[in-house]
Interface confidence: medium
């Protein structure tokens, strides 16, 4: 059918509460295209009854709610006019009550539902919430083993819960709890959170800054020879790496035959209170496929891409 | 000991923008976030947003879209900008910090600078 | 947004009394409140913060009770510089609210 397929990340979902996904693949969905969700390659679209259990509301899958048998390869069609992707979404649904005392045997947990506090820092912990625009979210409220957090050290800001002065008794498990409302209808949305204590701060008690790129396009003629840095801040004392992947894989291991895309050598210039690191990669020759296609920047938790595209003048006729 | 001291233009004419500039002493910005309140002629006080210690900003929903904050922490200086000023956005306006312990929000106040919006 | 109300707009006084200024937010904020004093002409001063523990300082006579919605400043033995605004503040939840505020009078 002429449709290029894109795979991308597994969902592990959690049963008997909303979930949407938003198919979105920036190189594609910032033109003029057409989105159309699919569940295991039926030919079949997914309902866009607003009414349906699983409908597709624009861009996103809706699932209201999840249900144990939703497990299941999805796709979502986004033609344009001259190009057609077919992405690849694995949800899996499990069982969970985030207050059982068995909080083990999730498998790989994305990294939504386990995160970070620095120790003696101000942090803060993230609600995520991802629905499309026809669902509107009630305030959100956070419980610690199952009970309401209320304590001093904590203020609720939109989707996050600000901890003051972090103390290692701050791990464990958290939820975040929502209710979400569609058509008049309401629904509780429970993320379970695991929470675990570094002593590590980050550049100014947070994760490292990309400063350059910043999730762009960037026009370069077939053919010719390319070299983008990474620059990133980041605290004196870290202990983070910083690369370049595509597909999720490291680009000297993703090239590692033909080499012609490498990272370079890492440099870094010392400031007071942080450094500044560089990090390049280098495309010999550009190629057909290298557009559309996200380089990462990966430093620590935090990612910026880049995407290839061929110069203006080549789209004319369009 | 922990200072805030705001700079301010006094008058300002409607839609035109306010800039107020809060220099810290006594602290570094890079361990601090600094809140931005202001205070009416009727006394009331009003949160309108901050800046966390790694330069990401959060704002009270009205001001969202004429309200920005930037800092130069080497400089121990942070910037206040409000676009659209109408009358009654007429207050004090001050940059404050928590205490160095839970809970003890706004512990320093700055000394507030006088914004009157005018014709 | 919770709302921090307080419902003495005025509170008229006398030296040595026992005074108490209530302030009422429209959500459990637990013991998220805290106290402010404010002189003609300066910056608000903390006084309370966790509803009831006392800023460094800040003298006895001033004590902060309560939980959940109901919060009460209590001023045990007031003295001329007492006379002040006082308001409260939540910090549960953003954004970030004060209440109207209480004026303390002499009779």
């Known amino acids: 059918d002429g449709c290029k397929d894109i795979f991308m990340k597994n969902e592990i979902l959690s049963a008997s509460q909303p979930f949407a996904f938003n198919c979105t693949f920036p190189p594609i969905t910032s033109g003029e295209v057409s989105v159309t969700w699919y569940k295991n390659s039926s030919k079949i679209p997914v309902s866009k009854i607003i009414q349906s259990r699983i409908h597709q509301d624009e861009t996103w899958i809706l699932f209201l709610p999840m249900e144990w048998g939703d497990s299941g390869v999805y796709q979502c069609v986004i033609k344009g006019r001259d190009s057609c992707h077919r992405i690849h979404v694995n949800l899996t649904v499990f069982e969970k009550h985030w207050c059982d005392t068995s909080i083990g045997g999730l498998p790989n947990l994305s990294d939504e539902y386990k995160q970070i506090l620095h120790l003696g820092k101000d942090d803060s912990l993230t609600c995520h919430l991802h629905f499309p625009k026809s669902c509107v979210l009630g305030p959100i409220k956070w419980y610690k083993d199952c009970n309401e957090i209320k304590g001093e050290r904590f203020t609720v800001l939109e989707t996050r819960l600000l901890v003051s002065n972090v103390s290692a008794e701050d791990r464990g498990n958290y939820a975040c709890q929502a209710i979400l409302t569609h058509s008049g209808k309401q629904y509780e949305v429970l993320n379970g959170i695991t929470v675990s204590i570094t002593e590590r701060a980050g550049y100014g008690g947070s994760v490292p800054k990309i400063i350059y790129p910043k999730n762009h396009s960037i026009e370069v003629q077939l053919g010719t020879t390319l070299i983008v840095d990474c620059n990133v801040t980041d605290t004196k004392d870290n202990t983070n790496l910083r690369c370049w992947r595509v597909n999720n894989t490291l680009v000297d291991d993703y090239y590692d035959e033909s080499k012609r895309i490498r990272e370079g050598v890492e440099t870094h210039v010392s400031f007071r209170e942080h450094n500044l690191y560089t990090v390049n990669i280098t495309f010999l020759e550009v190629k057909m496929e290298d557009y559309g296609l996200p380089f990462m920047c990966h430093a620590g938790v935090s990612t910026a891409y880049i995407i290839l595209q061929l110069p203006a003048p080549d789209f004319r006729a369009y | 000991q922990v200072q805030l001291k705001e700079s301010g233009p006094g008058l300002v004419a409607p839609s035109q923008s306010l800039s107020i500039t809060c220099t810290v002493s006594g602290f570094s910005l890079t361990n601090y976030a600094v809140h931005w309140v202001r205070q009416f002629p009727g006394k009331g006080l009003e949160w309108l947003g901050v800046i966390w210690s790694d330069g990401s900003t959060d704002f009270n929903a009205p001001f969202k879209s004429r309200l920005s904050i930037n800092k130069d922490n080497s400089k121990s200086q942070v910037f206040f900008k409000m676009n659209s000023l109408q009358i009654d956005d007429t207050a004090i306006y001050y940059c404050?910090?928590?205490?160095?312990?839970?809970?003890?929000?706004?512990?320093?106040w700055g000394q507030g600078t006088l914004v009157t919006v005018s014709a | 947004d919770i709302v921090m109300t307080q419902s003495q707009k005025f509170l008229s006084t006398s030296v040595g009394v026992r005074v108490s200024v209530t302030c009422k937010a429209s959500q459990d904020v637990g013991t998220n409140v805290l106290w402010y004093q404010q002189k003609i002409g300066q910056s608000p001063k903390p006084l309370i913060y966790?509803?009831?523990y006392r800023h460094s300082g800040v003298p006895d006579r001033f004590t902060g009770s309560g939980s959940g919605t109901d919060f009460t400043l209590i001023i045990s033995n007031v003295q001329s510089e007492d006379l002040a605004e006082y308001f409260c503040q939540q910090y549960s939840r953003y954004p970030l609210t004060f209440g109207p505020g209480t004026k303390l009078e002499l009779k």
């Open positions: 966790s509803a009831s």
């Open positions: 404050a910090r928590k205490g160095g312990y839970s809970g003890s929000w706004f512990a320093y």
